[in-house]
């Protein structure tokens, strides 16, 4: 068309929120969709001045399509003024946003209400228990198995005796980490389960109960004394 | 006996810099999270700084967010609080305090073991 | 951040007869585990503060059973059952459910 105009915004419900406040860490989008002809050229400043790539670590990205600016793994230093300038020939028009980066506070681990659940089985079965770790800070876990030893669950100390049955390693996901498979269960394997899951503010943990049915059309079979565990 | 030792206090000029160490033992240092804690003479008690047990995670008060950094040393049992910029209001007693360690606990998990902490005077 | 409430400023206490200590937080120290995450301390003059109670209400190894402590979500009381002389000095009440940990302004237990 050779109807000239001066840039106007197309969509100016996507630029009604004009204060965001983002985690660190987050990304952040801001949008000014715009039309005009010829189509207008987009720029941006950060508080007044020209935004440029090197005033942030890693940069930012603008989609020219899209009429965006994409901040990624947003800090404190990012916080401010972000206006876009929409212009051609026949005219500018901007907007302004605020983006203001909250830094959460970094919590204990939180373990979802609930997780591990309690289990049953029949000997020979399998099983598995979950947990669902949220943490701010890097969580280290570990599922733990209370044993006996001697016949006693607890030591001299009167602390309960443990064995650490999986724990985040290098090679371990937080994926793998969060599932404990117990495969062709016998009745030593009845007992308490924790998953525990640390932090360098503090450690959570939640237990739960494995019970061991004899098999169907089977006696309950007699089984030895177990190994005790070192 | 699990034992916090801290050094490196002293008087010191706003503006200059200072390390604080703090060598722990018998415990495994390696372990557990450590924490710095304050306390103005005469007034209460301060939070500072956390680093978590393998140094990947640190965190700080508002205070000092900036000016203090915290690290640590597994091979020699060692904590630090590398205290640029300092100014008047950080002058304080700062205690080494041991944070939560990585595994089950059936007592508190930290916060249990102070060192006597060492003084720092920041004066003109 | 945590705000900690401690009440109140002072204490003078007959040896023998009981003494009470509250500290309230702005936020629920109530955690997803079950457990509330109030510490209490006492540090004497010239000493580093020592470890009461943790998790609202257990006592720390060592502790006489003459101290307890008490509470539900953002309301803690510590107790001296009979005070002794050895009791003397300054008792905190610290959050430690999330950074920055955050300490109650102390309150001073004297004999009188």
């Known amino acids: 068309s050779n109807n000239k105009r001066a840039p106007y915004w197309t969509n100016t419900e996507k630029m009604e929120k004009r204060l965001h406040a983002v985690p660190a860490a987050n990304t952040v989008k801001f949008r000014c969709p715009a039309g005009g002809n010829p189509m207008p050229t987009m720029r941006w400043l950060k508080n007044g001045k020209e935004f440029k790539q090197e005033h942030r670590i890693g940069g930012y990205k603008v989609r020219n399509q899209h009429w965006s600016l994409i901040m990624e793994s947003v800090v404190p230093s990012d916080k401010g003024n972000y206006t876009c300038v929409v212009e051609n020939e026949y005219g500018s028009i901007n907007h302004t946003y605020h983006l203001d980066v909250v830094e959460r506070s970094p919590h204990r681990p939180i373990l979802q209400a609930g997780l591990p659940a309690n289990a049953s089985t029949v000997v020979g079965g399998d099983v598995e228990f979950v947990c669902k770790v949220y943490s701010d800070a890097q969580p280290h876990i570990q599922w733990i198995k209370h044993v006996e030893k001697n016949g006693s669950k607890y030591g001299p100390d009167g602390l309960p005796y443990l064995k650490v049955l999986k724990a985040a390693g290098v090679n371990t996901t937080d994926k793998e980490i969060e599932v404990l498979y117990i495969r062709n269960v016998t009745f030593e394997d009845a007992g308490e389960y924790t998953c525990l899951a640390g932090n360098s503010i503090g450690i959570s943990f939640h237990s739960a109960w494995l019970t061991v049915l004899p098999a169907p059309g089977r006696e309950k079979e007699i089984t030895a004394s177990p190994d005790y565990l070192e | 006996e699990v034992q916090l030792l801290e050094s490196g206090g002293g008087v010191v000029q706003p503006g200059r810099s200072l390390r604080l160490s703090c060598a722990a033992s018998?415990?495994?240092?390696?372990?557990?999270?450590m924490h710095w804690v304050r306390q103005a003479p005469g007034k209460g008690l301060e939070w500072v700084a956390v680093i978590s047990y393998d140094g990947s995670n640190k965190y700080y008060a508002d205070s000092v967010k900036g000016r203090f950094t915290i690290s640590r040393d597994n091979s020699k049992n060692t904590l630090s609080l590398q205290m640029n910029s300092l100014r008047v209001e950080d002058t304080a007693i700062y205690y080494c305090?041991?944070?939560?360690?990585?595994?089950?606990?059936?007592?508190?998990?930290?916060?249990?073991?102070w060192g006597q902490g060492t003084m720092v005077t920041v004066s003109s | 951040d945590i705000v900690m409430t401690q009440t109140p400023l002072s204490l003078s206490v007959t040896p023998g007869q009981p003494a009470s200590i509250s500290c309230t937080s702005s936020?629920?120290?109530?955690?997803?585990?079950?457990?509330?995450?109030v510490y209490w301390y006492l540090q004497k003059p010239g000493q580093p503060p020592q470890l009461l109670i943790y998790e609202l209400s257990n006592r720390f190894s060592g502790v006489p059973d003459r101290f307890s402590g008490s509470g539900s979500r953002t309301d803690f009381t510590l107790k001296i059952s009979r005070v002794e002389a050895e009791d003397v000095g300054v008792y905190y009440c610290m959050q430690y459910i999330e950074a920055p940990l955050t300490f109650g302004g102390g309150t001073k237990v004297e004999i009188k």
């Open positions: 018998g415990f495994t240092f390696s372990s557990y999270a």
């Open positions: 936020r629920s120290l109530l955690h997803s585990d079950g457990k509330t995450y």
């Open positions: 305090v041991r944070g939560a360690g990585r595994g089950y606990t059936y007592g508190p998990d930290g916060f249990d073991i």
